[in-house]
Interface confidence: low
C-alpha cells in the first residue's frame, strides 16, 4: 500500500518489520502521475534512478541483523542535479531513500540555500514499505516558479541522531531580463557629457543592453549588461530608456527625462505684505527653476518719483523663504520693486515691477537752530526754531512738542506743550523764578514724535534782574550747552 502525507514537522512511522536478505535498492512508485497527451503542465523529474553511491552525507548504521550482517550505508539516491525552466512554469522534483524497517522515527525536511523550508510549500512524502526496507520519496513541487525560487535544494533526514543529506538539486528559473539598475532622471548642463547606467540580469545570460533616445536607438551595437551610456551632451530635453535582451526576449526600462539646465523664469506675483515708514516686506512666487536649484534672489528697488535720479538699490537674499524686508527706505515714498532669482546657470529676468509706498513715520531729525530768550516784561520765555528738512520729516508735519524743565533749589518740574505745524516760534510762561529753564523741541507727524533737539538752558532770575540775552542750540558737539547770564 502507498502512504501519502503532506510534509509536516512530525516524524513519519516507518513500518517496522524483519529485514532478512539484501536491501532492495530500487522501487517502482505505486503511484504514477501521467500527463495528458501533448500537454505537460509541469516539469516532473523522477528521482528513483538507481545509481552510483551517494557522495553526500552517509549514515553507516551500527545495527546488525540476527545474522550480525552490517547494514549498508544509508544514502539518498541520485536524482537530477540541475533543472532549468521558464518563469511561471511548474516543476516537481524529489529525493528518495531506502531505509531499513528497523528505524522507527525519521523525518525528511527540505532545505533551500541553507535554510529549512517550512510552511505552505508543496512537499509530499510517499512511503513504499516491503519486508525489509521502506522506500521513501519526498517530492517538492512549485506550481508557478519565480526568480526567487532559484537556488540549491536538498533533502535532509535525521536517523539515529545522524543527518543524511542529499545531493543538491539546482533550480534555475529563466525569464525575461530583470532590471537591477535603471537609468535615472537627470538635469544636465547644455552640451556637457553625462552618464546613464542600465543593468539587468537573467537567467538566462548574457543580457545585452540597447539604449533608446527619444524612441530611437542610440547604439548600433548592444553592450553586455551592465552598460554605461556616455552622452556627449544635449541641447534639448530628451527621454532615454534601455532595452535588455536575453534569449527569453526583451524588457524595456522606464523612460527617464534628461532635462537641460537653463536660467530660471522670472518670479511672479510679487506682493506687498507689510509697509512701514522705512521698510517694505515683500513676497514672491518663484518662477520655474530651470531644472537647477535656486541659489539666491535679488530685490531691485528704485524710487518711483519722476524727479529722482533713477538709481537702483539692490538687496541680495537667499532664495528661501521667498520673503524679504527691504529696509532703509524713506518714509512716505513711492518705490518700484522687482525681483530676480538665480541658479547655477544664471539670473532670471526681473519680475514684473510693482509699485509700493512707505507709510508716514515719525520725523528722523529734530527742529534746527532752537533759540530761547526771556521776555521779562511779559514774564514769558520765547522759543524759536527752524523746521527739520522736508525729506527728514518722514511725513506731513502736524506740529511740535516742546519740553521745558524748570529747576531751582531742590525743585524740578517738566511741562510739555503742543503747538501747531505752521509756526516756528512759541511762547511759554515763566513757571519759576531764580531757576534754570531747559527747553527741547521735537517735530510731530501722524507717524509719531521725532527726536528732541539738544537741550537749551536759560536762567530765569528773580524779579527785577533784566537780561535780554538769548540762549540757543549750540554748535554740534557741545553736550550740555549752558548760557551763563
Amino acid at each position: 500500500a502507498i502512504t501519502e502525507a503532506r510534509e509536516e514537522a512530525k516524524p513519519y512511522p516507518l513500518f517496522p518489520g524483519p529485514f532478512p536478505g539484501s536491501l532492495q535498492t530500487d522501487h517502482t512508485p505505486l503511484l504514477s502521475l501521467p500527463h495528458a497527451s501533448g500537454y505537460q503542465p509541469a516539469l516532473m523529474f523522477s528521482p528513483t534512478q538507481p545509481g552510483r553511491p551517494h557522495t553526500g552525507n552517509v549514515a553507516i548504521p551500527q545495527v546488525t541483523s540476527v545474522e550480525s550482517k552490517p547494514l549498508p550505508p544509508l544514502a539518498f539516491k541520485h536524482t537530477v542535479g540541475h533543472i532549468i525552466l521558464s518563469e511561471h512554469k511548474g516543476v516537481k522534483f524529489n529525493c528518495s531513500i531506502s531505509v531499513p524497517n528497523i528505524y522507527q522515527d525519521t523525518t525528511i525536511s527540505w532545505w533551500k540555500d541553507g535554510k529549512e523550508l517550512l510552511g505552505a510549500h508543496h512537499a509530499i512524502t510517499q512511503f513504499y514499505p516491503d519486508d525489509e526496507v521502506t522506500a521513501i520519496i519526498a517530492s517538492f513541487s512549485i506550481t508557478s516558479v519565480q526568480r526567487s525560487d532559484n537556488g540549491s535544494y536538498i533533502c535532509k533526514m535525521k536517523i539515529n541522531n545522524e543527518e543524511i543529506v542529499s545531493d543538491p538539486i539546482y533550480i534555475e528559473v529563466q525569464g525575461l531580463p530583470h532590471f537591477t539598475k535603471q537609468p535615472e532622471s537627470m538635469n544636465v548642463t547644455r552640451n556637457t557629457a553625462f552618464n546613464l547606467t542600465c543593468q539587468a540580469v537573467g537567467p538566462p545570460e548574457p543580457v545585452n543592453i540597447f539604449w533608446v533616445q527619444n524612441s530611437s536607438r542610440v547604439n548600433e551595437q548592444p553592450e553586455k549588461s551592465p552598460s554605461v551610456l556616455t552622452v556627449p551632451g544635449l541641447t534639448e530635453m530628451a527621454v532615454f530608456s534601455c532595452e535588455a535582451h536575453n534569449d527569453k526576449g526583451l524588457t524595456v526600462s522606464k523612460g527617464v527625462q534628461i532635462n537641460i539646465k537653463a536660467i530660471p523664469s522670472p518670479p511672479t506675483e510679487v506682493s506687498i505684505r507689510n509697509s512701514t515708514a522705512h521698510s517694505i516686506l515683500i513676497s514672491w512666487v518663484p518662477g520655474f527653476d530651470g531644472y537647477s536649484p535656486f541659489r539666491n534672489c535679488s530685490i531691485q528697488v528704485k524710487e518711483a518719483d519722476p524727479l529722482s535720479n533713477g538709481s537702483v538699490m539692490i538687496f541680495n537674499t537667499s532664495a528661501l523663504p521667498h520673503l524679504y524686508q527691504i529696509k532703509q527706505l524713506q518714509a512716505l515714498a513711492n518705490y518700484s520693486i522687482g525681483v530676480s532669482c538665480m541658479n547655477e546657470i544664471g539670473w532670471s529676468a526681473v519680475s514684473p515691477w510693482i509699485l509700493a509706498s512707505t507709510t508716514e513715520g515719525a520725523p528722523s531729525v529734530a527742529p534746527l537752530n532752537v533759540t530761547v530768550f526771556l521776555n521779562e516784561s511779559s514774564d514769558n520765555v520765547d522759543i524759536r526754531w527752524m523746521k527739520p528738512p522736508t525729506k527728514q520729516q518722514d511725513g506731513e508735519l502736524v506740529g511740535y512738542r516742546i519740553s521745558h524743565v524748570w529747576q531751582s533749589a531742590g525743585i524740578s518740574k517738566e511741562l510739555l506743550e503742543e503747538v501747531g505745524q505752521n509756526g516756528s516760534r512759541a511762547r511759554i510762561s515763566v513757571q519759576v523764578h531764580n531757576a534754570t529753564c531747559t527747553v527741547r523741541i521735537a517735530a510731530v507727524t501722524r507717524g509719531g514724535v521725532g527726536p528732541f533737539s539738544d537741550p537749551v538752558k536759560i536762567f530765569i532770575p528773580a524779579h527785577g534782574w533784566v537780561d535780554y540775552a538769548p540762549s540757543s542750540t549750540p554748535a554740534p558737539g557741545n553736550a550740555d550747552p549752558v548760557l551763563i547770564i
Epitope: 545585452n208 524612441s215 548592444p222
Partner: antibody, heavy 120, light 108 residues
Framework: QVQLVQSGAEVKKPGASVKVSCKAS????????INWVRQAPGQGLEWMGW????????KYNEKFKGRVTMTTDTSTSTAYMELRSLRSDDTAVYYC?????????????WGQGTTVTVSS | EIVLTQSPDFQSVTPKEKVTITCSAS???????FHWYQQKPDQSPKLLIK???NLASGVPSRFSGSGSGTDFTLTINSLEAEDAATYYC?????????FGQGTKLEIK
C-alpha cells in the same frame, strides 16, 4: 514559428525603381530589426541596411545611401525596401532577414528572397 | 569597413571527411560578433553558428566553430552529402555588416 515572406520577382528597366516587401509573422514585429541583404548571381552576400520597426530608425550601408529607402508598416508587420535609379548591376536576389543583437549582429531568420532583374 | 577573407574559395570533399574553412578579418573582432551561415543551392542562407562557437537551433553537432582575434574557423567533422553548400562568415562588430566571399563545398 517565425516566418518572413517576401513579394514576387520583379523585372525593371535601368533608371526605374523597385519596392520589395517582407511580411513578418510568428514574433513581435517591432522588437527586432529587419535587414536587407542582396546576392548578385553567383556572388556573395552584401548587407544593404536595417530598419527598426518600432521607431523607423534606419542604418544604411554607405554604398546604397541616397538610392535606398527602408520603411515598415507595423499594422501589417510588413517591411519594405525601395531601390531607385536601378542599374544592371543591381540584378540580384534581395533577402530580408531578422537581425538579432545578442551580440550584434547576426541574422537568425531569412525571407525566401525576391529576384530583381534589371534589363533594358 | 571590416573585410572578411575566406579560405578556400572552393573545396571538393568525400563524405565522412573532416572539413575546415577559415575566415580572416582585417580587424580584431570579439568572438561574440562572429557568425557562420550555410546556403544551399536555390535556398536562403541559414544561420549555422552564432558567436563563433554556438550552434544555431537544429544544427547537427558535427558542425563546430572556433577562433578569436582575426582568425576564425568552421569545422565539419564527418561530412555528409546534405552538407553540400556555400558557407559564409559574417561579422557583426561594425557597420557596414560584412560577409566573407563564401566557400563552396562540393561532395564528391
Amino acid at each position: 514559428q517565425v516566418q518572413l515572406v517576401q513579394s514576387g520577382a520583379e523585372v525593371k528597366k535601368p533608371g526605374a525603381s523597385v519596392k520589395v516587401s517582407c511580411k513578418a509573422s510568428g514574433y513581435t514585429f517591432t522588437t527586432y530589426d529587419i535587414n536587407w541583404v542582396r546576392q548578385a548571381p553567383g556572388q556573395g552576400l552584401e548587407w544593404m541596411g536595417w530598419i527598426y520597426p518600432r521607431d523607423g530608425y534606419t542604418k544604411y550601408n554607405e554604398k546604397f545611401k541616397g538610392r535606398v529607402t527602408m520603411t515598415t508598416d507595423t499594422s501589417t508587420s510588413t517591411a519594405y525596401m525601395e531601390l531607385r535609379s536601378l542599374r544592371s548591376d543591381d540584378t540580384a536576389v534581395y533577402y530580408c532577414a531578422r537581425g538579432y543583437y545578442d551580440n550584434l549582429y547576426y541574422f537568425d531568420y531569412w525571407g525566401q528572397g525576391t529576384t530583381v532583374t534589371v534589363s533594358s | 569597413e571590416i573585410v572578411l577573407t575566406q579560405s578556400p574559395d572552393f573545396q571538393s570533399v568525400t563524405p565522412k571527411e573532416k572539413v575546415t574553412i577559415t575566415c580572416s578579418a582585417s580587424s580584431i573582432i570579439s568572438s561574440n560578433y562572429f557568425h557562420w551561415y550555410q546556403q544551399k543551392p536555390d535556398q536562403s542562407p541559414k544561420l549555422l553558428i552564432k558567436r563563433t562557437s554556438n550552434l544555431a537551433s537544429g544544427v547537427p553537432s558535427r558542425f563546430s566553430g572556433s577562433g578569436s582575434g582575426t582568425d576564425f574557423t568552421l569545422t565539419i567533422n564527418s561530412l555528409e552529402a546534405e552538407d553540400a553548400a556555400t558557407y559564409y562568415c559574417q561579422q557583426g562588430r561594425s557597420v557596414p555588416l560584412t560577409f566573407g566571399q563564401g566557400t563552396k563545398l562540393e561532395i564528391k
